[in-house]
């Protein structure tokens, strides 16, 4: 079953390579277990950036080595991606799955274009 997922169209990463955006889904049921996946689309290639499964009301738990962190509040997920560089500029798509209990729902956002600008190196000071 399809589910609507909303996310901002454009986000500019900070000078430290950190980008945050909200992924909001229109939950048609009373899910207790939700999975959120961030996908990156660049040059028609789609790769998984990170994924987390969480119980409603609990924190998102990404893998220890993940570049993502996040918090949840109701039907909103606040996602933060760290360690971004200019080459990571691309479309970041939020995929939400209501896993348990059934029925299963899948929603895919239109994507957030994240622009990353590498900071200029500091000039040498004598």
């Amino acid at each position: 079953k399809a589910m609507h997922v909303a996310q901002p169209a454009v986000v500019l990463a900070s000078s430290r390579g950190i980008a945050s955006f909200v992924c909001e889904y229109a939950s048609p049921g009373k899910a207790t277990e939700v999975r959120v996946t961030v996908l990156r689309q660049a040059d028609s290639q789609v790769t998984e950036v990170c994924a987390a499964t969480y119980m409603m009301g609990n924190e998102l738990t990404f893998l220890d080595d993940s570049i993502c962190t996040g918090t949840s509040s109701g039907n909103q997920v606040n996602l933060t991606i760290q360690g971004l560089r200019a080459m990571d500029t691309g479309l970041y798509i939020c995929k939400v799955e209501l896993m348990y209990p059934p029925p299963y729902y899948l929603g895919i956002g239109n994507g957030t274009q994240i622009y990353v600008i590498d900071p200029e190196p500091c000039p040498d000071s004598d």
């Epitope: 207790t32 799955e97 348990y100 209990p101």
Partner: antibody, heavy 119, light 107 residues
Framework: QVQLVQSGAEVKKPGSSVKVSCKAS?????????WGWIRQAPGQGLEWIGA???????YYSPSLKSRVTITADKSTSTAYMELSSLRSEDTAVYYC????????????WGQGTLVTVSS | DIQLTQSPSSLSASVGDRVTITCRAS??????LAWYQQKPGKAPKLLIY???NRATGIPSRFSGSGSGTDFTLTISSLQPEDFATYYC?????????FGQGTKVEIK
């Protein structure tokens, strides 16, 4: 009619890996269903291993998560379950099963694949 | 994990008997419970899903009831082909879990 046909019996050494396949026919695997894997040790009950959804997402039993990988090839309507670092207690019949997305009970099952782990 | 406990573990009955098997969950699973029948050397067969809905092609002598933590599978009039092992399964939470099984034998 719906059919799930699994690969044949395997005999494996402890520490090795096994990959069991499950080919579906008679329905569209890309919508409305997920694939579950369940095992049954000799004379024992049923144990859920994990599942794969049409979105590509996988779910695993916490007790097997570090050793199991479930994949699916949509082009051939085939699911795979790979279990690594095999030990004698992994000896069991491994079943694949179809689960509707509206309820996660398993309405069609494969014939089962006996995996024997022995030195 | 949600534990499912079936009772009895085994029972002896005669053809025509009314048989009742219970399944108790360690926490509420609402109505997200299924029942299966398994015969030796065969894959399980789905009988009931969502606690009380009969699966396609299952005879009306099989019925399921219950919600929350207590569930029942009833066979109203046992037939020769019903001698088998029966399992309950919850799918309210991950990981999916099964009961330990109830073996129905011929008296």
């Amino acid at each position: 009619q719906v059919q799930l046909v699994q690969s044949g019996a395997e005999v494996k050494k402890p520490g090795s890996s096994v990959k069991v396949s499950c080919k579906a026919s008679g329905y569209s695997i890309t919508s409305g269903y997920h694939w579950g894997w369940i095992r049954q040790a000799p004379g024992q009950g049923l144990e859920w291993i994990g599942a794969i959804y049409h979105s590509g997402s996988t779910y695993y039993s916490p007790s097997l998560k570090s050793r199991v990988t479930i994949t699916a090839d949509k082009s051939t309507s085939t699911a795979y379950m790979e279990l690594s670092s095999l030990r004698s207690e992994d000896t069991a019949v491994y079943y694949c099963a179809r689960g509707p997305l509206s309820y996660y009970a398993f309405d069609y099952w494969g014939q089962g694949t006996l995996v024997t782990v022995s030195s | 994990d949600i534990q499912l406990t079936q009772s009895p573990s085994s029972l002896s009955a005669s053809v025509g008997d009314r048989v009742t098997i219970t399944c108790r969950a360690s926490q509420s699973v609402s109505r997200y419970l299924a029942w299966y029948q398994q015969k030796p050397g065969k894959a399980p067969k789905l009988l009931i899903y969502d606690a009380s809905n009969r699966a396609t092609g299952i005879p009306s002598r099989f019925s399921g009831s219950g919600s929350g933590t207590d569930f029942t599978l009833t066979i109203s009039s046992l037939q020769p082909e019903d001698f088998a092992t029966y399992y309950c399964q919850q799918y309210y939470r991950s990981p999916i879990t099964f009961g330990q099984g109830t073996k129905v034998e011929i008296k």
